[in-house]
């Protein structure tokens, strides 16, 4: 799609013919539906000026108009070789993926002097991509907010009402606010200054592929890698895989890594797939059936058929016109087209092309070297085809730039800053001094010293949005695919080895020994009326209180000398008053001074995929749920076994926190979910269960002073 | 308090052209997009355009030939312009400030098409 | 342009019962869609937002659902003066576009 709007009808559409090959190794295709512009650079250049500002009114056109002072701005606000021609370097900025929001100049003139003049910013997300999960773009969002909390006394609240200050949308083309995006790449994105009404808003172009920078987000299920996203592109065998595969598998069930290299790794999960469950619909997630007769069809793929909306289905009996029993087949991110002819369409993997056969995305036929795959298993006969996802755009980014226009803040002209017009994708830290100088100008820096995270308070929706699909339920263990793509993966470490004997020693102190200065425990438990706080085989006791201070360190192997030094999670059961230990693969629970284990974690009922258990939170009487990584069970403590039906994913009970804590706990009736120095604390209020708070566990639970 | 408040001809006769006034208070355009809907006696609402705020229009397609809506900000006033019209033109015309739906909607002027 | 139907132009209810007024779209406008209350000789009036999000004010019995292309509105417990025409919007895709209306009628 052409960068800029207006030029949409010069687009040119090829015909459906091959071109005569050129004299080099491949044969170059033209493929049926592949857009290409005839616009000259002049043109290009014409549109780019005006549309960011640096040409007044659109009429300057025409060869006697000289481009030369409008080129000279735009040089020198994006730092390029100030030539005042048209040249590569030039020319390559104008095509490069941008914020829509004008370097020069604004969109309008909107009242106000810009800035937000209270501290606690609100944000609604009106909706969803469905380029990544909702937990996904959640946390995006949140992180973005935090990178410009943690440099200025603001803070950022989400709240479900259009009430809010910044409201988020994912739109497409014209999407209520008079400044259409464009199609894909191009215009990424665009923001409003401070203000009411749309003023403040940030928008986000849903035509792109938004990722987290590196490709598309495939969360797996099963496997052996405790529901990580998969790695594209991955080896297996020796080959390169951009997509899901269903290679080295009798069952038809796609897989991929989660790891850059399946040979060396063994790291895999399972992708979405209609073989492994279906959503929403009327059959509880079953997969679908295939092949199932509809209106007295067989059908052996999902379909579209019978339907206005475009949504594939299938049903998950033989006979849906006898049983009527159907659901949604799970869209495949990683290879659903973009472009070509087939837009939205799945690979079909193999393909032919030229007589040879593809399994996976290639770039043969091309001179542009971009991915792309038929979506019929033969292109010579059926010429259908699509470009295969890239890299994406990482919505941490991009929202991170739009939050500081939201904010107050104008394109910056240094190359390497956040809120430079041109996305660049970085996994350094995203602010540069310019930005921080910024935004520090509009509103002053942190009274305090140290940085800190948003604090989230979240207040109820008056109606909760339905969340729709809610995603299927956790399939039954007796109908989980075999473990790997070339069987069950060996058996991991069992976990750690229990603490040698010890002597009660008094621990010498040192600053390590205040846990002020702790920047991540290993494990926080509620026991008794205190916090308990575990790290390298010492803790530390607080309770809450005006000026009070954690107490410690103690040695763990005083108190509990069956313990090993480096503790994954600790929970008590008050009815019981038992203490639950958990380190990798094992777990010992003192009843007093009496202790069980270390016992494998097998006799709980949570299977070799499970490698340790990161937290615990009490789930009714004499019951708990247990969390590894993202997926959790429902425990029950005097039968000490998990309930194997229970398993859910932690994004679909628990919205919007981390999805790689490292510790869950409970405190004062809250769940608190750590990452890194963070937690991410959730109420639960009407069985809804909704991030309130997101703070610092040693500043904001522990009091620790900030200098 | 917001307020939109249109005013109109009340009776056109047929060929001739229509304008209406939507003034508007409590609010800035430069913030909100401002709707035009008709309602024919005893039918549903019919969205007719739109004023976004840094001044892009978009008409609904049907009437886009006949159709023009304009604002100056400084005055708070909205325009809506509809040449040709016939007796099925006849309607009440509302505008209405738009944000994630139509919340606040003037009283509408009632416009009859006649000779 | 993107059609919205609303099946039925008339309902009729009970004070007290719970009404469910359906609307299916064209094709997918995702949760863009707003449901209007319209008195006798008054102009509409914004209840739901954005599919399932009341507006300011509102009361809690009006509940909004639907994503995609059928989105539901519903009145859990019927007020005598809850008498009024329906409309849903979808504000998806411009020309953004009205269903026809369900009269709500007490019995």
């Known amino acids: 799609m052409s960068l800029w709007q207006p030029l949409v009808l010069v687009l040119l559409v090829l015909g459906c013919c091959f071109a005569a090959p050129r004299q080099r190794q491949s044969t170059l295709v033209l493929f049926p539906g592949d857009l290409r512009t005839n616009l000259t650079d002049r043109q290009l250049a014409e549109e780019y000026l005006y549309r960011y500002g640096y040409t007044r009114v659109a009429e300057m056109r025409g060869e006697s108009k000289s481009l030369g002072p409008a080129l000279l701005l735009l040089q020198k606000q994006l730092s390029l070789p100030e030539t005042g021609e048209l040249d590569s370097a030039t020319l390559k900025a104008m095509r490069t993926p941008r914020c829509g929001v004008p370097d020069l100049g604004r969109f309008q003139t909107f009242e106000g002097d810009l800035k937000w003049h209270h501290h606690n910013i609100t944000y609604w997300i009106q909706n969803y991509s469905e380029d990544l999960p909702r937990a996904v773009i959640d946390d995006a969002f949140a992180r973005a907010f935090a990178l410009w909390s943690a440099v200025t006394p603001l803070t950022f609240t989400r709240v479900y009402s259009r009430d809010a200050d910044i409201v988020i949308q994912f739109g497409v083309a014209e999407h209520g606010d008079g400044y259409p995006f464009d199609g894909k790449d191009g215009l990424l994105a665009h923001a409003f200054p401070p203000g009411p009404g749309i003023q403040g808003d940030a928008h986000f172009d849903d035509d792109e592929l938004w990722s987290l920078g590196k490709g598309v987000v495939v969360p797996t299920r099963f496997g052996n890698a405790d529901g990580a996203a998969c790695h594209f592109p991955f080896i297996f065998e020796g080959r390169s895989y951009s997509a899901c595969t269903t290679d080295g598998r009798s069952d038809g069930l796609p897989w991929c890594s989660t790891t850059a290299n399946y040979d060396t790794d063994d790291r895999f999960g399972f992708c979405p797939s209609e073989r492994l469950y279906t959503q929403d619909g009327n059959a509880d997630g079953k997969p679908c059936q295939f092949p199932f007769i509809f209106q007295g069809q067989s059908y052996s793929a999902c379909t579209t058929d019978g339907r206005s909306d475009g949504y594939r289905w299938c049903a998950t009996t033989a006979n849906y016109d006898r049983d009527k029993l159907f659901g949604f087949c799970p869209t495949r991110a990683d290879s659903t087209v973009m472009g070509g002819n087939s837009a939205g369409e799945l690979c079909v993997f193999p393909f032919t092309f030229l007589g040879k056969e593809y399994s996976t995305c290639t770039s043969e036929g091309r001179g542009d070297g971009r991915l792309w795959c038929a979506t019929t298993s033969n292109f010579d006969s059926d010429k259908k085809w699509g470009f295969c996802p890239d890299q994406g755009y990482s919505l941490f980014l991009v929202a991170a730039h739009e939050f500081g226009h939201a904010l107050g803040l104008d394109h910056s002209s240094v190359p390497e800053a956040l809120m430079y017009p041109m996305y660049r994708f970085t996994e350094g830290p995203p602010l540069h001094k310019d930005d921080v100088n910024g935004i520090r100008h509009l509103y002053g820096p942190r009274p305090e010293p140290e940085p800190r995270p948003p604090t989230t308070t979240t207040p109820q929706p008056t109606a909760p949005p339905t969340v729709c699909p809610t995603g299927p339920p956790t399939v039954h263990p007796s109908e989980r695919p075999t473990a790997g793509p070339t069987g069950p993966p060996s058996a991991g470490p069992t976990g750690p080895p229990t603490a040698g004997p010890s002597t009660a020693t008094t621990v010498p102190l040192s600053p390590v020994d205040d846990a002020c200065n702790v920047n991540i425990f290993d494990a926080i438990a509620e026991i008794g009326n205190q916090l308990y706080l575990f790290k390298d085989g010492k803790y530390w006791r607080f309770s809450e209180g005006r000026g009070s201070r954690p107490q410690g360190p103690f040695l763990i192997a005083d108190k509990w000398p069956a313990l090993p030094r480096k503790l994954d999670s600790v929970f008590e059961e008050r009815l019981s008053k038992k203490l639950f230990f958990f380190s990798g693969r094992q777990v010992w629970v003192y009843t007093g001074a009496s202790v069980l284990g270390p016992r494998r974690l097998d006799k709980l009922g949570l299977g070799a995929d499970v490698a340790q258990v990161t937290g615990a939170l009490r789930s009714g009487r004499g019951k708990m749920l247990l969390f590894s990584g993202r997926r959790l069970w429902r425990f029950d403590v005097k039968a000490q076994m998990v309930d194997p039906r229970s398993a859910s994913e932690v994004d679909r009970m628990f919205p919007g926190v981390p999805l790689d804590t490292h510790d869950v706990f409970q405190y004062r009736e809250k769940a608190y979910f750590c990452q890194d120095r963070f937690y991410w604390r959730v109420s639960s209020r009407s069985e809804l269960n909704q991030v309130d708070q997101v703070g610092y566990v040693t500043y904001d639970i522990l009091q620790c002073p900030e200098d | 308090q917001v307020q939109l408040k249109e005013s109109g001809p009340g009776l056109v006769a047929p060929s001739q052209s229509l304008s209406i006034t939507c003034t508007v208070s409590g609010f800035s355009l430069l913030s909100y997009g401002v709707h035009w809907v008709r309602q024919p006696p005893g039918k549903g609402l019919e969205w007719l355009g739109v004023i976004w705020t840094g001044g892009t229009t978009n008409y609904n397609s049907a009437l886009m030939s006949r159709l023009s809506i304009s604002k100056d900000d400084s005055k708070s006033q909205v325009f809506l312009k509809m040449n040709s019209l016939q007796t099925d033109d006849t309607a009440i015309y509302y505008c209405?400030?738009?944000?994630?739906?139509?919340?606040?909607w003037g009283q509408g002027t009632s416009v009859t098409v006649s000779s | 342009d993107i059609v919205m139907t609303q099946s039925h132009k008339f309902m009729s209810t009970s004070v007290g019962d719970r009404v469910s007024i359906t609307c299916k779209a064209s094709?997918?406008?995702?949760?863009?869609v707003a449901w209007y209350q319209q008195k006798t000789g008054q102009s509409p009036k914004l209840l739901i937002y954005s599919s399932s999000y009341r507006n300011t004010g509102v009361p809690d019995r009006f509940t909004g659902s639907g994503s995609g292309t059928d989105f539901t509105f519903t009145i859990s417990s019927v007020q005598a003066e809850d008498l009024a025409v329906y409309f849903c919007q979808q504000h998806y895709i411009t020309p953004y576009t009205f269903g026809g209306g369900t009269k709500l009628e007490i019995k």
């Open positions: 094709q997918d406008v995702r949760n863009t």
């Open positions: 209405a400030r738009y944000y994630y739906g139509m919340d606040y």
